[in-house]
Amino acid sequence: EPPTACREKQYLINSQCCSLCQPGQKLVSDCTEFTETECLPCGESEFLDTWNRETHCHQHKYCDPNLGLRVQQKGTSETDTICTCEEGWHCTSEACESCVLHRSCSPGFGVKQIATGVSDTICEPCPVGFFSNVSSAFEKCHPWTSCETKDLVVQQAGTNKTDVVCGPQDRLRA
């Protein structure tokens, strides 16, 4: 790391080290030999989250309901607003600037992980012995019915999209 001219939480201006403004405040005027750095608190709906020499605070993020967004955590003078998505939707990026509807898992696929406000549904193909016959954002793959436990026999084999069909035992068999 290269050497720095100033202490931590200071900056160099006009060959002199001045104190940075603390989080939640913006720079009004640099220090001089006789005066300290002048800082002012950020206004309503503004923030600065680091020690800084910014002359303008950043605007809080707007969680636009038209994009499916809502406020997860209200911003302060030191933190930005955190947006999340309405129920049934998830963010399209880490910054959560817009939302998309949770994906449904097609027949033959089940839900491995239910979607959250920030991640989409994760689907997995139904393995042998399991099926899903619906398009759903919640349903897991279901196990095929066990005909034997019902004293029945398999009349039609199951697939990844259909359950087995059970029927009565063939009484003519010895």
Epitope: R7, Q16, T35
Partner: antibody, heavy 126, light 107 residues
Framework: QVQLVQSGAEVKKPGASVKVSCKAS????????MHWVRQAPGQGLEWMGW????????NYAQKFQGRVTMTRDTSISTAYMELNRLRSDDTAVYYC???????????????????WGQGTLVTVSS | DIQMTQSPSSVSASVGDRVTITCRAS??????LAWYQQKPGKAPNLLIY???TLQSGVPSRFSGSGSGTDFTLTISSLQPEDFATYYC?????????FGGGTKVEIK
């Protein structure tokens, strides 16, 4: 009362490393930058760098960049200075020196040393 | 880096004399300057900081003045215990730099 007690004298061969310790007592260790200053025999004072014991942040003089490492152990209020790849011209008395309290200074770096360790003589000789 | 030039490099004086040491910075350092006294085999001792503020416990015969690039340390009436080497140090920006020292010797 404030005291900075340094480790004892060291004799090292060229190319070796040395690690000097500086144990602080009598004040809040984390509240003051600790600097290291050296003085070659019969010569003046040379600033090496500082460590902020609170954050662990460091700042080294360009001359020592890549060769010096300053660390601290706040649990025992001790600062360390390690110098690698020693040369004969590194023979000097090494001092730790306490800075003004953090937050004392708003303009300038205001690094004035009100307390010093007793010094550690490091001799580099083959 | 800011260069600090001290003069003279040595001065011979008698007890009771007024001694003046100067320090010049290669660029303006406002009032961010300190003066130290060092005796043989000992660590330096802070005398003055921010160019003119006397460190607690330092006798009032020591005084400092100046700002910008030119600074002065004055010992108004030299005492036997004042025979030592004196260093100036700029505290405006890192890297901190010291003057080459002024040795005050007995005439």
């Amino acid at each position: 009362q404030v005291q900075l007690v340094q480790s004892g004298a060291e004799v090292k061969k060229p190319g070796a490393s040395v690690k000097v310790s500086c144990k602080a007592s009598g004040y809040a260790f984390a509240g003051f930058y600790m600097h290291w200053v050296r003085q070659a025999p019969g010569q003046g004072l040379e600033w090496m760098g500082w460590i902020n014991p609170d954050s662990g942040g460091t700042n080294y003089a360009q001359k020592f960049q890549g060769r010096v490492t300053m660390t601290r152990d706040t649990s025992i209020s001790t600062a360390y200075m390690e110098l690698n790849r020693l040369r004969s011209d590194d023979t000097a008395v090494y001092y730790c020196a306490r800075d003004q309290p953090l937050g004392y200074c708003t303009n300038g770096v205001c690094s004035y040393f009100d307390y010093w360790g007793q010094g550690t003589l490091v001799t580099v000789s083959s | 880096d800011i260069q600090m030039t001290q003069s003279p490099s040595s001065v011979s004086a008698s007890v009771g004399d007024r001694v003046t040491i100067t320090c010049r910075a290669s660029q303006g350092i406002y009032s961010w300057l300190a003066w130290y006294q060092q005796k043989p085999g000992k660590a330096p001792n802070l005398l003055i900081y921010t160019a003119s503020t006397l460190q607690s416990g330092v006798p009032s015969r020591f005084s400092g003045s100046g700002s910008g690039t030119d600074f002065t340390l004055t010992i108004s009436s030299l005492q036997p215990e004042d025979f030592a080497t004196y260093y100036c140090q700029q505290a405006n920006i890192f890297p901190l730099t010291f003057g080459g020292g002024t040795k005050v010797e007995i005439k």
